[in-house]
């Protein structure tokens, strides 16, 4: 039952990654552990896209639980053949994986845009603006520019770290869902089991 085991493994990985995405996104609302910036709406616009909470988080739990459920042994058959039901389930998991691809893709895109634009911060002229927006992401390579942001404390480090984490987590989720698309298609077409004998039975 290698296709099912693979799907289950991917499912468990996605649950962990989704939870990490949700945590990373929540932390973006509290720069330096303070709530005042969220209440004053002094947060990057891309924080409000909920990419980690929705895209890489909640939306990822749906395919994750579908994948985990694929290895259950009491799967109903079709036309008297148990494995046919499992093959249908494997093919339907491809749809769930596509939802996962959409969610993780959204997470990756928003995180990349958040990194490119940089944080909303108080600059040395007392203006709340996207201080690094005009640098087209070059600020990421020149940490000496980060001191342009005078508030919140360490906001550039905070934003860069968390959006990078969301980018990485979303990327891993995307790859895992892509693997499950391939796994689901192979499992559905070639049969649920690895042995040629069992495939023939179906």
């Amino acid at each position: 039952m290698c296709y099912g085991k693979c799907a289950r493994c991917i499912g468990h990985s996605l649950v962990g990654l989704a939870l990490l995405c949700i945590i990373a996104n929540i932390l973006l609302y509290f720069p330096n552990g303070e709530t005042k910036y969220a209440s004053e709406n002094h947060l990057s616009r891309f924080v409000w896209f909920f990419s980690g909470i929705v895209g890489g988080g909640l939306l990822m739990l749906l395919p994750a639980f579908v994948f985990i459920g694929l290895e259950q042994d009491d799967c109903c058959g079709c036309c008297g053949h148990e494995n046919c039901g499992k093959r249908c389930a494997m093919l339907s998991s491809v749809l769930a994986a596509l939802i996962g691809i959409a969610g993780s893709g959204y997470c990756v895109i928003v995180a990349a845009l958040g990194l490119a634009e940089g944080p909303l911060c108080l600059d040395s002229f007392g203006q709340w603006n996207y201080t690094f927006a005009s640098t087209e992401g070059q600020y990421l390579l020149d940490t000496s520019t980060w001191s342009q942001c005078t508030e919140p404390k360490h906001i550039v480090e905070w934003n860069v770290s968390l959006f990078s984490i969301l980018l990485a987590l979303g990327g891993i989720e995307f790859i895992l869902c892509l693997i499950q698309v391939i796994n689901g298609v192979l499992g559905g077409i070639c049969g649920f089991c690895c042995s040629r004998q069992q495939q023939y039975d179906c």
Epitope: S124, T135, S147, Q148, E151
Partner: antibody, heavy 113, light 107 residues
Framework: EVQLQQSGPELVKPGASVKMSCKAS????????MHWVKQKPGQGLEWIGY????????NYNEKFKGKATLTSDRSSNTAYMELSSLTSEDSAVYYC??????WGRGTLVTVSA | DIQMTQSPASLSASVGETVTITCRAS??????LAWFQQKQGKSPQLLVY???TLAEGVPSRFSGGGSGTQFSLKINSLQPADFGSYYC?????????FGSGTKLEIK
């Protein structure tokens, strides 16, 4: 009306230290960065550093690290700059500026034996 | 550190004239540039920041332009109050260095 009241002129001996103040009024002190700028007589402007009174974040011009120390006291709405190990090169007018928009009148420091 | 080169070092002009002061950065500073005016014995005053944003209370005859490494401050229809020294300053990274200044004198 925003006002930055700087402390009076200082005549100090080489090797000594001096601490000047910049008392702010007319705005929320902790909401704005305070910059410090040096100007030698008849010369141009030199940025020393800034302090954010809310977060106490400071950033210095590398040239003034170890020379200048920026602090602030939110209870009295006052920013301070202490200059140590003074030499004749430190003789100048020192300005405090709220986000560059509003400037103090400057504190003249004269280092002389 | 980023070097800021101002030109000319000094300039004589008459009331009503239009003058342009230029500032060159040794490295791309995007639009992170400010202009200051300082009159003899007085504190500097912010005129322009972010290359072209006029500070509050600054007359519209002042205008800033440029980006990257080349910047300019244009003063239309010079007034007696406009004479003094002008400084550019980048605020791209630490240290926020000033130009050496341009002294604008009455002809």
């Amino acid at each position: 009306e925003v006002q930055l009241q700087q402390s009076g002129p200082e005549l100090v001996k080489p090797g000594a230290s001096v601490k000047m103040s910049c008392k702010a009024s007319g705005y929320t002190f902790s909401s704005y960065v305070m910059h410090w700028v040096k100007q030698k007589p008849g010369q141009g402007l030199e940025w020393i550093g800034y302090i954010n009174p809310y977060s106490d974040v400071t950033n210095y011009n590398e040239k003034f690290k170890g020379k200048a120390t920026l602090t602030s006291d939110r209870s009295s709405n006052t920013a301070y700059m202490e200059l140590s190990s003074l030499t004749s090169e430190d003789s100048a007018v020192y300005y405090c500026a709220r986000n560059y928009f509003d400037w103090g009148r400057g504190t003249l420091v004269t280092v002389s034996a | 550190d980023i070097q800021m080169t101002q030109s000319p070092a000094s300039l004589s002009a008459s009331v009503g004239e239009t003058v342009t002061i230029t500032c060159r950065a040794s490295k791309n500073v995007y639009s992170y540039l400010a202009w200051f005016q300082q009159k003899q014995g007085k504190s500097p005053q912010l005129l322009v920041y972010n290359a072209k944003t006029l500070a509050e209370g600054v007359p519209s005859r002042f205008s800033g332009g440029g980006s990257g490494t080349q910047f300019s401050l244009k003063i239309n229809s010079l007034q007696p109050a406009d004479f003094g020294s002008y400084y550019c300053q980048h605020h791209y990274n630490i240290p926020f260095t000033f130009g050496s200044g341009t002294k604008l004198e009455i002809k």
